[in-house]
């Protein structure tokens, strides 16, 4: 696709005559017709296969034609073509006389031709104008012409389409031969590929616009050459994404388990000795007088209640001392000076001699315990009642007071709420965790199906022949009151026309 441009420069018709030699009156008001066509060895006026164009009246007799291209005018004349320029052409330029304003051929005088020129030859596409001058006995025409490609067409014959663009489909301008020339920062056959930031890692980085470096998953850094360790990796590094290679002294999946806790945290207090004992674990060996995981507690040796049989403990510099109650002795008051003769067993406990009377043991009745049966047993401490039942101590035994819906010694049995048939009018009962639910038959509603819901049996218009319908609320049925001339439960039979029976 291109344009043949013809620039008319000067026309000389000094005598102001037509081609026939007849003078124009008052002068030759001259306009031009241009016919561009395929190459002909002998140019004939036939069809203008490449196009035709006419000018307005440009002057009278002799005149120069001003270049009017900048003002959007008609010089140079434009003859566009939408095919591959063949490199050869024929051109006919006619000068005509128009006495009036109507330039149509049929409106011209029959001898309106002033001059005609016909040229043919080769013409390559290019910016340079070819200057030519044609002279006859009566006239002279000076003009120049060239062929240029239309916008977006390039090449020797304007056959290469190239439209500069700067969008998703490409970022380029067009070279004179129609090849693409990528805009700065773009590459590829159609200049669709951005050139990433210099140094951006070839595999791990990419970009959607020039001088950018976007990292693929697992990579980071300005040039996407640093791997991202496993999410949550605390004291570790990576050589490929999502790794967590632990630093020295750390372990575990996330390198967050301290294998050298003693050094990193010094957890043992009060001069205790620390020993690493695995991932994030350690053992403190306390100095005398200290206790606790980290030996943080000063040790009171009475804290372990070492004194038996009601002996009282006294802390001492080098340990403790038990003050025994009457009848007891020993380091921990563990030896009794009492015997069964002293009746040491309370609450009806039975005394049994031991070690040839040097010792005794009490056998306690139910509900009592202790070495002297001095403690009462609380039978409710083990919460024996199920389903929220309340435990009550009743002398030697206990009992459970159950919540509604439960029964049994320990309220372990669920009482069926449906057992007493609570749903009225044939409703179906369903046991639920927190009660019951009734599904009511048609015509009843309410929590226990106790409410009668009347059904309008007339709603379906069962009566024929404009009979009046009544609902029987006791049976939920309908009654049809027939108009004169009709009988039947639905007033469907006319009187005198009994139904036709098959017999």
């Amino acid at each position: 696709s291109g344009v043949f441009q013809l620039q008319l420069q000067e026309f000389i018709n000094e005598r102001g005559v037509l081609a026939s030699g007849r003078p124009c009156e008052p002068g030759c008001r001259t306009f031009f017709r241009v016919c561009l066509k395929h190459f002909q060895a002998v140019v004939s006026p036939g069809p203008c296969t490449f196009g035709t164009v006419s000018t307005p009246v440009l002057g009278t007799n002799s005149f120069a034609v001003r270049d009017d291209s900048s003002g959007g005018g008609r010089n140079p004349l434009q003859l566009p073509f939408n095919f591959t320029w063949p490199g050869t052409f024929s051109l006919i330029i006619e000068a005509w006389h128009a006495p009036g304003d109507d330039l149509r051929p049929e409106a011209l005088p029959p001898d309106a031709l002033i001059s005609k020129i016909a040229i043919q030859g080769s013409l390559a596409v290019g910016q340079n104008w070819l200057l030519d001058e044609q002279t006859s006995t009566l006239t002279r025409l000076r003009y120049s012409y060239r062929v240029i490609c239309s916008d977006n067409y390039y090449g020797d014959n304007c056959s290469r389409l190239c439209k500069k663009r700067n969008d998703h489909f490409g970022h380029y301008v067009c070279q004179p031969d129609g090849n693409l020339s990528c805009l700065p920062g773009w590459t590829g056959e159609y200049c669709q590929q951005p050139i990433c930031l210099s140094g951006c890692h070839e595999q791990n980085g990419y970009c959607s616009k020039p001088a950018e470096c976007l990292c693929r998953p697992g990579w980071q850094g300005r040039l996407c050459n640093e791997c991202i360790p496993h999410n949550g990796c605390r004291h570790g590094t990576c050589s490929t994404p999502w790794q967590c290679t632990c630093d020295e002294g750390w372990g575990g999946l996330f390198c967050d388990q301290d294998l050298n806790y003693c050094t990193h945290h010094s957890p043992c207090k009060n001069g205790a000795t620390c020993s690493n004992s695995g991932q994030r674990s350690y053992t403190c060996t306390c100095r005398p007088g200290y206790t606790g995981v980290d030996c943080e507690l000063e040790l009171s040796e009475c804290d372990s209640n070492p004194c038996r049989n009601g002996g009282s403990c006294k802390d001492q510099e080098d340990g403790y001392h038990c003050l025994c109650p009457p009848g007891y002795y020993g380091l921990h008051c563990e030896h009794s000076t009492l015997s069964c003769a002293d009746s040491p067993c309370f609450n009806g406990g039975s005394c049994r001699e031991r070690n040839q009377g040097a010792n005794y043991a009490c056998e306690c009745p139910p509900n009592f315990t202790g070495s002297n049966c001095e403690k009462k047993v609380d039978r409710c401490t083990s919460n024996p009642c199920a389903n929220g039942g309340q435990c009550l101590n009743r002398g030697p035994s206990r009992m459970c007071r159950c919540r509604p819906g439960f029964t049994g010694t320990y309220c372990e049995l669920h009482v069926s709420d449906c057992a007493r048939n609570p749903c009225a009018h044939g409703g179906t009962c369903h046991d639920l965790e927190n009660g019951l639910m009734c599904t009511c038959p048609a015509g009843f509603s309410g929590r226990r199906c106790e409410v009668r819901t009347s059904i309008d049996a007339c709603a379906s218009s069962p009566c024929f022949n404009r009979a009046t319908c009544y609902t029987d609320l006791s049976t939920d049925t309908f009654v049809c009151n027939c108009p004169y001339g009709f009988v039947g439960s639905r007033c469907e039979f006319p009187v005198g026309l009994p139904p036709s029976f098959p017999w």
Partner: antibody, heavy 119, light 106 residues
Framework: EVQLVESGGGLVKSGGSLRLSCAAS????????MSWVRQAPGKGLEWVAI????????YSADSVKGRFTISRDNSKNTLYLQLNSLRAEDTAVYYC????????????WGQGTMVTVSS | SYELTQPPSVSVSPGQTASITCSAD??????VSWYQQKPGQSPVLVIY???TRPSGIPERFSGSNSGNTATLTISGTQAMDEADYYC?????????FGGGTKLTVL
């Protein structure tokens, strides 16, 4: 149908007069130049006169100048040729022809009317 | 006065090409028309503006004009093409016809 029909021809004595008419139909008569062309028996075509579409411009051959007058009535779609001072050499078939604008030539011709000048 | 010169007669065999010339000084600067006239009939325009055929004229009729000579060419001449042919141009006085050429199809 585009048509030109001449009339008014006949036998006339030398020095006499005739008025030829040409009735046009099938085209816009008032928009076209019209002409008269004659052909003597056994001879070639000879142009006689031509008139512009509005009658403002008239041209005639040197051989008939001052004797023949071309005119037109656009309201009647009719072309005329007034022949005065007729001579024997004016004997010919007179054709009425429509002239195409812009050097197209004469694209419509009538059937002709015979003018015979006797001495 | 301007004169258009034609040969009085041209003969051609059927199917052959006939060429009729029309000469005058610098005729190529003008547009030439050609007319066919058969005996007893009015002339008919067959070529105008050197080489253009009016509608209805067969393609075997063509024309050219350059220098001092215009040419009417009838290719594949048929018996029905036998007629008188006239060229026509303009001079300062008005319309000019050539003397005519009788085409005979043998």
């Amino acid at each position: 149908e585009v048509q030109l029909v001449e009339s008014g021809g006949g036998l006339v004595k030398s020095g006499g007069s005739l008025r030829l008419s040409c009735a046009a139909s099938g085209f816009t008569f008032r928009s076209h130049w019209m002409s008269w062309v004659r052909q003597a028996p056994g001879k070639g075509l000879e142009w006689v006169a031509i008139i512009s579409y509005d009658g403002s411009n008239k041209y005639s051959a040197d051989s008939v100048k001052g004797r023949f007058t071309i005119s037109r009535d656009n309201s009647k779609n009719t072309l005329y040729l007034q022949l005065n001072s007729l001579r024997a050499e004016d004997t010919a078939v007179y054709y009425c022809a429509k002239a195409g604008g812009g050097n197209v030539g004469f694209d419509i011709w009538g059937q002709g009317t015979m003018v015979t000048v006797s001495s | 006065s301007y004169e258009l010169t034609q040969p009085p007669s041209v003969s051609v065999s059927p199917g052959q090409t006939a060429s009729i010339t029309c000469s005058a000084d610098e005729l190529g600067t003008q547009y030439v028309s050609w007319y066919q006239q058969k005996p007893g009939q009015s002339p008919v325009l067959v070529i105008y503006q050197d080489a253009t055929r009016p509608s209805g004229i067969p393609e075997r009729f063509s024309g050219s004009n350059s220098g001092n000579t215009a040419t009417l060419t009838i290719s594949g001449t048929q018996a029905m093409d036998e007629a008188d042919y006239y060229c026509q141009a303009w001079d300062r006085s008005g319309v000019v016809f050539g003397g005519g050429t009788k085409l005979t199809v043998l």
